[in-house]
Interface confidence: low
């Protein structure tokens, strides 16, 4: 009796079970009663990453420099090319089809987490006692200068955007 289901890595065709092509190879012809499934390796710019019965391999992803992309990992016959973003850019989406510049943290905010190729800069407000006077994609909030340790006094209070201003102590005559 002809099979109604096949084992793993097989497929049912013309009432018989044929072997699937292994990753990196495409189907040329189905098996017959007398011959095995015929498969051919994908060409250099193509891949198939599963056991399959595809008659065409998939084209490797193109890491388009116009989109700020570069190759992170070159594709093989069994894997797709992995793109990442150029320095200073990160992916717009999980599939990394294009890149955008890292956000800078505005004055009053510091970098909590520096951007990576796949995630943007995470900024945080500078808490009391800290400041940032620059727009930067890598600078953390800096602590106010400690006037006391320099034997000076605070002449102007600090803010989240400015450091304290220290000055000499008024000497008693």
């Amino acid at each position: 009796e002809p099979p109604t289901a096949c084992r793993e890595k097989q497929y049912l065709i013309n009432s018989q079970c044929c072997s699937l092509c292994q990753p990196g190879q495409k189907l040329v012809s189905d098996c017959t009663e007398f011959t095995e499934t015929e498969c051919l390796p994908c060409s250099e710019s193509e891949f198939l990453d599963t056991w399959n019965r595809e008659t065409r391999c998939h084209q490797h992803k193109y890491c388009d420099p116009n989109l700020g992309l570069r190759v992170q990992q070159k594709g093989t016959s069994e894997t797709d090319t992995i793109c990442t973003c150029e320095e200073g850019l990160h992916c717009m989406s999980e599939s990394c089809e294009s890149c955008v510049p890292h956000r800078s943290c505005l004055p009053g905010f510091g970098v909590k987490q520096i951007a990576t190729g796949v995630s943007d800069t995470i900024c945080e407000p500078c808490p009391v006692g800290f400041f940032s006077n620059v727009s930067s994609a890598f600078e953390k909030c800096r602590p106010w200068t400690s006037c006391e340790t320099k034997d000076l006094v605070v002449q102007q209070a600090g803010t989240n955007k400015t450091d304290v201003v220290c000055g000499p102590q008024d000497r008693q005559r």
Epitope: N66, M92, V100
Partner: antibody
Framework: EVQLQQSGPDLVKPGASMKISCKAS????????VNWVKQSHGKSLEWIGL????????TYNQKFKGKATLTIDKSSTTAYMELLSLTSEDSAVYYC?????????????WGQGTSVTVSS | DIVLNQSQKFMSTSVGDRVSITCKAS??????VAWYQQKPGQSPKALIY???DRRTGIPDRFTGSGSGTDFTLTIDNVQSEDLADYFC?????????FGAGTKLELK
């Protein structure tokens, strides 16, 4: 600099649909996004949505979902917006506006606009 | 949706004056604001992006400033060719939204 050439003005009947084209003077659209913007007579600008020519991915303003459909033909570097089931409310000038990937929403380059009049 | 309020629909000015056009966002949009100039019968033209960066070819009498919710476009030494409508745009969040516009006219 990218030039965007839009199709000419159109007079259409209520209930009809129409398609506006936006042809870019670039060898390759890759690396640009194309936004579409509506300007009703004497009024401000409304963002309809954008399409990424690289993969045909679209993002719509919820208000225009079902009203506008954005498509792209990479081979001719032309973007299209189809407007469906037109009413008098859709009479306006429609612009395509493009920007480079490094700031995909800033709309650096604008087409000349396509005037659409919906009237029986 | 984020609303951009350009409270002055019209602003009167004279050639040589300095004028400031304001745009207030209903929530924090950081510096994701652009400014456009539109003359009658023409397409909008990009002037400023990311709140304060001037587009290539835009005269330096146009200056953008602000962050968070309050933004200003300042035109120093106004010229007759600057008489136009000015719109702000936020691109911090979808949907992108424009202000209602400020018309700059002669006194």
């Amino acid at each position: 600099e990218v030039q965007l050439q839009q199709s000419g003005p159109d007079l259409v009947k209520p209930g009809a649909s129409m398609k506006i084209s936006c042809k870019a003077s670039v060898y390759s659209f890759t690396g640009y996004t194309v936004n579409w913007v509506k300007q009703s007579h004497g009024k401000s600008l409304e963002w309809i949505g954008l399409i990424n020519p690289y993969n045909g991915g679209t993002t719509y303003n919820q208000k225009f979902k079902g009203k506008a459909t954005l498509t792209i033909d990479k081979s001719s570097t032309t973007a299209y917006m189809e407007l469906l089931s037109l009413t008098s409310e859709d009479s306006a000038v429609y612009y395509c506006a493009s920007s480079y990937y490094s700031n995909p929403y800033a709309m650096d380059y604008w087409g000349q606009g396509t005037s659409v009049t919906v009237s029986s | 949706d984020i609303v951009l309020n350009q409270s002055q629909k019209f602003m009167s000015t004279s050639v040589g004056d300095r004028v400031s056009i304001t745009c207030k966002a209903s929530q924090n949009v950081h510096t994701a604001v652009a400014w456009y100039q539109q003359k009658p019968g023409q397409s909008p033209k990009a002037l400023i992006y990311l709140a304060s960066d001037r587009r290539t070819g835009i005269p330096d009498r146009f200056t953008g400033s602000g962050s968070g919710t309050d933004f200003t476009l300042t035109i120093d030494n106004v010229q007759s060719e600057d008489l136009a409508d000015y719109f702000c745009l936020q691109h911090w969040n979808y949907p992108l939204t424009f202000g209602a516009g400020t018309k700059l006219e002669l006194k």
